[in-house]
């Protein structure tokens, strides 16, 4: 009686179980009662990443420099090429089909997490006692100057965008 289901790494064709082609190879011809499944390796710049019965290998992804992409990991016959973004850019999606520039943190905000090729800059507001006076994709909030440790007094309080202004002790109101 012909099988209705096959073992793992097999497929059902013409009422019989044939072996699937291993990753990195494509199907040339199905097995018969007398012959094994015929498979051929994928060509240059092609891949198949699973046990399969595909008659065509997939093309490796092209990391288009015009979209800000570069190769992070070269593809093999069993894996696709992995693209990432050029310095200063990050992917717009998980599949990384294009890139956009990293966001800068505005004055009053500091960098909480520096951007990577796949994630944007994460900014956070500078709390009291800290400031940032620049737009930057790298700078954290900086602490206000301690006038006391310099034997000076605060002449002007700091803000989230400006440092404290220190002055001599005698300038007391």
């Amino acid at each position: 009686e012909p099988p209705t289901a096959c073992r793992e790494k097999q497929y059902l064709i013409n009422s019989q179980c044939c072996s699937l082609c291993q990753p990195g190879q494509k199907l040339v011809s199905d097995c018969t009662e007398f012959t094994e499944t015929e498979c051929l390796p994928c060509g240059e710049s092609e891949f198949l990443d699973t046990w399969n019965r595909e008659t065509r290998c997939h093309q490796h992804k092209y990391c288009d420099p015009n979209l800000g992409l570069r190769v992070q990991q070269k593809g093999t016959s069993e894996t696709d090429t992995i693209c990432t973004c050029e310095e200063g850019l990050h992917c717009t999606s998980e599949s990384c089909e294009s890139c956009v520039p990293h966001r800068s943190c505005l004055p009053g905000f500091g960098v909480k997490q520096i951007a990577t090729g796949v994630s944007d800059t994460i900014c956070e507001p500078c709390p009291v006692g800290f400031f940032s006076n620049v737009s930057s994709a790298f700078e954290k909030c900086r602490p206000w100057t301690s006038c006391e440790t310099k034997d000076l007094v605060v002449q002007q309080a700091g803000t989230n965008k400006t440092d404290v202004v220190c002055g001599p002790q005698d300038r007391q109101r």
Partner: antibody
């Protein structure tokens, strides 16, 4: 020890101004922020503004901007909060409190004045 | 401005009970550079000025009984009274001091059951 002593209760007419004082002792007045907070009858706490007496630097809550003036006299270690164009909704207890001392790590209010009741009524 | 929301607005409890008050901020009060949480808790009794209990979300102010404790980070914070005493019946406020303007929660009244 740290002490903040406020001026006495006031009754004011709508449209007038009130000036509440807060005399500090037991710490370096000029380098510590003085904060002003108010509490309407049966309501919660509302921050109004603050001053760093040594520099005269101030911060105000937007709600009170233009109507409140906070000043300080370092010679007498006294801070003042003046609220103008009074209306009935300004009836509240007004508190001063000590904020950061220049260490930039003590922004919470660890000492409070006893409060000053301001009643606005025609 | 950072909004502070306390819950519940009132709680009825008996002496010896464990009481938990929560406070939620509209944005994170944790700063990555120093990993500090810019939040304080105050106790206020009728006709009296507020009294500082907890600062930096979990540091106990000098002289405050150890039955009071604070926890939390980011946007969610908790004040716990482990075993309520008669003198603890009061209103409790959370307050952030991350950036101006400072704002308070609306208060939680702890009443006798």
């Amino acid at each position: 020890q740290v002490q903040l002593v406020q001026s006495g209760a006031e009754v004011k007419k709508p449209g007038s101004s009130v000036k509440v004082s807060c005399k500090a002792s037991g710490y370096t007045f000029s380098t510590s922020w003085i904060e002003w907070i108010r509490q309407a009858p049966g309501q919660g706490l509302e921050w109004m503004g603050s001053i760093l007496p040594g520099s005269g630097s101030t911060n105000y809550a937007q709600k009170f901007q233009g109507r409140v003036t906070i000043t300080a006299d370092t010679s007498t270690s006294t801070a003042y909060m003046e609220l103008s164009s009074l209306r009935s909704e300004d009836t509240a207890v007004y508190y001063c409190a000590r904020g950061d001392d220049g260490s930039y790590v003590r922004w919470y209010f660890d000492h409070w004045g006893q409060g000053t009741l301001v009643t606005v009524s025609s | 401005d950072i909004q502070m929301t306390q819950s519940p607005s009132s709680v009825s409890a008996s002496v010896g009970d464990r009481v938990t008050i929560t406070c939620r901020a509209s944005q994170s009060l944790t700063f990555s550079v120093n990993q500090k949480n810019y939040l304080a808790w105050y106790q206020q009794k009728p006709g009296k000025a507020p009294k500082l209990l907890i600062y930096w979300a979990s540091s106990l102010q000098s002289g405050v009984p150890s039955r009071f404790s604070g926890s939390g980070s980011g946007t969610d914070f908790t004040l716990t009274i482990s075993s309520l005493q008669p003198e603890d019946f009061a209103t409790y406020y959370c307050q952030h001091y991350y950036s101006y303007p400072w704002t308070f929660g609306q208060g939680t009244k702890v009443e006798i059951k």
